[in-house]
């Protein structure tokens, strides 16, 4: 004999307390699949979390973070404080990146500047706390007779197909 609970639709639960009636989920709860014997409690987006999607009888609420914070973890399980570019978050709050490191985002850690010399290149633009260095051409490319500027291609007259 088929279990009647298996056919209770999403948004309901098979209420054993009430002789296996497919009863609507109580407020602030949901069942996203059929055949459930209980409804799951809706996630509440409190404090630093804010509601991105309200809970319904068939789907859980979804949270994101209030301004000044960003989501971490699956389904935004945590909110982490934003820092400015050029900073990283430590246990003591936002701290400027140390010399030789940078962070171009409001989250994450400071990372070391690129070491241009490892690629045999020179530093074209110095790094800052917010930006990585920009590596230039290798010194060999700058030897006498070598042009560092590519000449522009000749312009075609309009209306003519290339030969």
């Amino acid at each position: 004999l088929q279990d009647p609970c298996s056919n209770c639709p999403a948004g309901t639960f098979c209420d054993n307390n009430r002789n296996q009636i497919c009863s609507p989920c109580p407020p602030n709860s949901f069942s996203s699949a059929g055949g459930q014997r209980t409804c799951d409690i809706c996630r509440q987006c409190k404090g630093v979390f804010r509601t991105r999607k309200e809970c319904s009888s068939t789907s859980n609420a979804e949270c994101d973070c209030t301004p000044g914070f960003h989501c971490l973890g699956a389904g935004c399980s945590m909110c982490e404080q934003d820092c400015k570019q050029g900073q990283e978050l430590t246990k003591k709050g936002c701290k400027d990146c140390c010399f030789g490191t940078f962070n171009d985002q409001k989250r994450g850690i400071c990372r070391p500047w690129t070491n241009c010399s490892l690629d045999g290149k020179s530093v074209l633009v110095n790094g800052t706390k917010e930006r990585d260095v920009v590596c230039g051409p290798s010194p060999a490319d700058l030897s006498p007779g070598a042009s560092s500027v590519t000449p522009p291609a000749p312009a075609r007259e309009p209306g003519h197909s290339p030969q």
């Epitope: 009647p4 009430r18 009636i21 009863s23 109580p26 709860s29």
Partner: antibody
Framework: QVQLVQSGAEVKKPGASVKVSCKAS????????MHWVRQAPGQRLEWMGW????????KYSQEFQDRITISRDTSASTVYMELSSLRSEDMAVYYC???????????WGQGTMVTVSS | DIVMTQSPLSLPVTPGEPASISCRSS???????????LNWYLQKPGQSPQLLIY???IRASGVPDRFSGSESGTDFTLKISRVEAEDVGVYYC?????????FGQGTKLEIK
């Protein structure tokens, strides 16, 4: 809009059967259980039974167990309540009611008056 | 069966005044999900009943906030903060927890 429309008044003789229909509209019929409640003149409301509209399983009050049958036609979004071996005490208004919130009957039919008279 | 007992059976009220109806169940109506399965209905003259409160204290959709439900063990109360002429009718409590679901005998609210 969401509504339940019941069949019209009935006059029956003692010992006969009556079948009252309740047509649902404006919502997904198979999602919500349907209950039957009756009210004899000047009396309190009396619960008779329910049907899981989507599944078809039913539960009845012991008082009516041997005489009541609740059935449904999902294609017509209609639930039926049949009461047999009618007696004078069965003269009442019969209501269908949707359990649209947990434990709460949020939508009621307009009622069907059943008169039992010889 | 769970017996539901209401009081008073008749309640004359002056418009604008508060009103209170009591309902006592012979057994606990507490579900394993933490809610009390107790409803309040109003049946206006010549009409079908309408749901006011479910799960003890939750107002049904469209019910004015002058209606409120409270619970204490097996004692339940429906309060109307300021009675209006349209509130006349018979108020029923009902338990939908244990078959057979049972109703109170009703409280008739009338305007003085």
């Amino acid at each position: 809009q969401v509504q339940l429309v019941q069949s019209g008044a009935e006059v029956k003789k003692p010992g006969a059967s009556v079948k009252v229909s309740c047509k649902a509209s404006g919502y997904t019929f198979t999602t919500y259980p349907m209950h039957w409640v009756r009210q004899a003149p000047g009396q309190r409301l009396e619960w008779m039974g329910w049907s899981n509209a989507g599944i078809g399983n039913t539960k009845y009050s012991q008082e009516f167990q041997d005489r009541i049958t609740i059935s449904r036609d999902t294609s017509a979004s209609t639930v039926y309540m049949e009461l047999s071996s009618l007696r004078s005490e069965d003269m009442a208004v019969y209501y269908c009611a949707r359990e649209g919130v947990a434990g709460g009957f949020d939508i009621w039919g307009q009622g069907t008056m059943v008169t039992v008279s010889s | 069966d769970i017996v539901m007992t209401q009081s008073p059976l008749s309640l004359p009220v002056t418009p604008g005044e508060p009103a209170s109806i009591s309902c006592r169940s012979s057994q606990s109506l507490l579900h394993s999900n933490g809610y009390n399965y107790l409803n309040w209905y109003l049946q206006k003259p010549g009409q079908s009943p309408q749901l006011l409160i479910y799960l003890g204290s939750i107002r049904a959709s469209g019910v004015p906030d002058r209606f409120s439900g409270s619970e204490s063990g097996t004692d339940f109360t429906l309060k109307i903060s300021r009675v209006e002429a349209e509130d006349v009718g018979v108020y029923y409590c009902m338990q939908p927890l244990q078959i057979p679901y049972t109703f109170g005998q009703g409280t008739k609210l009338e305007i003085k």
